[in-house]
Amino acid sequence: NQDLPVIKCVLINHKNNDSSVGKSSSYPMVSESPEDLGCALRPQSSGTVYEAAAVEVDVSASITLQVLVDAPGNISCLWVFKHSSLNCQPHFDLQNRGVVSMVILKMTETQAGEYLLFIQSEATNYTILFTVSIRNTLLYTLRRPYFRKMENQDALVCISESVPEPIVEWVLCDSQGESCKEESPAVVKKEEKVLHELFGTDIRCCARNELGRECTRLFTIDLNQTPQTTLPQLFLKVGEPLWIRCKAVHVNHGFGLTWELENKALEEGNYFEMSTYSTNRTMIRILFAFVSSVARNDTGYYTCSSSKHPSQSALVTIVEKGFINATNSSEDYEIDQYEEFCFSVRFKAYPQIRCTWTFSRKSFPCEQKGLDNGYSISKFCNHKHQPGEYIFHAENDDAQFTKMFTLNIRRKPQVLAEASASQASCFSDGYPLPSWTWKKCSDKSPNCTEEITEGVWNRKANRKVFGQWVSSSTLNMSEAIKGFLVKCCAYNSLGTSCETILLNSPGPFPFIQDN
């Protein structure tokens, strides 16, 4: 049929970037290149129906379903999803094609289903059908990698029992501290399962698949480092493998390393040693302590000793179940409008947590940093001075943890007014929560100094923005004030703001703001 328009259906996958998550715009986020969904005419259907290729979406992913229509003249449209009609606003692109978009933010089960788009053009009417389902990731897993010694070789194998099969990489660094951050030039990555070079300062193995990326660091005691004030602590669950590396450098080969658990030498088969000469002809020795599957009695102080270095220990604690230890009492903060401030949560957890910060139904990425004392810390600074309730949520395989924060921003009240035939109301969201006065303006009181106390009702209410309080004051209209100007003022320790209202007969009320 030559009257039929040329139609293109595309799927745009969005990368959620925190500044825009949760905003319903047509182009809410940084996007990937569009994927063509085909849109073929459906045979044997009553009317003209185009069917797009089925769309599979990850939970919480954000997408746009988009239709490009090459047809003359204007078009009108309507989206229908689960018997509800949704607004549709077509626009035209540079090639004068009609563009219709449906943005789905943070995909959930309830947003899966058939999306029907009805388009009416000057020439014809037609329907486009999209089927959106959630990708079945229930069978997907991503497990933290662990180490095994390679049979008959001085090498480590990195294993992650995950579905789909993960890509395994070793992340190596030979600097100290901050310069071993992931994107630092000092970091070398090797996409292989077996590692032979085990003398580096910092050795991690990472596994990644569709569910993300998990890493495990090779726990190391460096005898050339000054003994730390805090004894390093390593947690493991019963049945997991234990690996600790002891490393020491000396001017010559005349030294040896030994491991002891609670004053008893480790049994043969629970350790292996490697040594090499470094570029400056010093000798590097490493001694691994390992247990292929730990039991409760493997708990204790593991001490690495050398004849040429101070001994150092690590406390290994074997637990039956993972945990998250932190104080979950809610915390309230009050800051100035331009004050720098970050929420922070200090916790001890095993296995490592996954976490999010949430404000007003928007989720923000959560970073965690290990401290020297075995604790970790997560900070959130991106509050943009918006008052309200902030939630930190953390979980691992065995435990969950939630902590609430309230942020109040100290500022002078700002007043909004509204009126009906029977009453006038003023609203303010300043902080500290303001107090109210009402004043009548008359010939006797042109400066509006005559205070009104009768018929005033004050209340505070929780605003839609989570945890943000709004104060309101309502004046019930009496004959004594009808036809007069009244002034409502909200005041707190930072200032006062007023709004003047003309209480005339029913109809639109003029408001005069006078701060």
């Epitope: 004894l231 004053n263 102080y301 000793s305 101070p310 001994s311 406390l315």
Partner: nanobody, 111 residues
């Protein structure tokens, strides 16, 4: 319950000497190495010396040649002999066995 108790601190003139003791109870002293640390006002705690189970001793560069660590397993006590003291040695001195710390003893070097 493991308890460590330091003693022997005090006020001494630059160039003078002091001998600190660390007595342990509730713990078989002979099975572990012992560290001495110190903390000057406004500074982090820093490692000073260690004596291993076998009696080998190690020192921080700042005290090498001036301090000597020793142990008496029969008395469950470790000692830190401090000679040629300098004002910068002023600090609270702590002994440590594994995760266990003493309360500390104050050493002040001043004329």
């Amino acid at each position: 319950q493991v308890q460590l108790q330091e003693s022997g601190g005090g006020l001494v003139q630059p160039g003078g000497s002091l001998r600190l003791s660390c007595a342990a109870s509730g713990f078989d002293f002979s099975i572990s190495y012992i560290d001495w640390y110190r903390q000057a006002p406004g500074n982090e705690r820093e490692w000073v010396a260690q004596i291993t189970r076998g009696g080998d001793s190690f020192y921080a560069d700042s005290v090498k040649g001036r301090f000597a660590i020793s142990r008496d397993n029969a008395k469950n006590t470790v000692y830190l002999q401090m000679n040629s003291l300098k004002p910068e040695d002023t600090a609270v001195y702590y002994c440590r066995i594994l995760s266990y710390w003493g309360q500390g003893t104050q050493v002040t070097v001043s004329s």
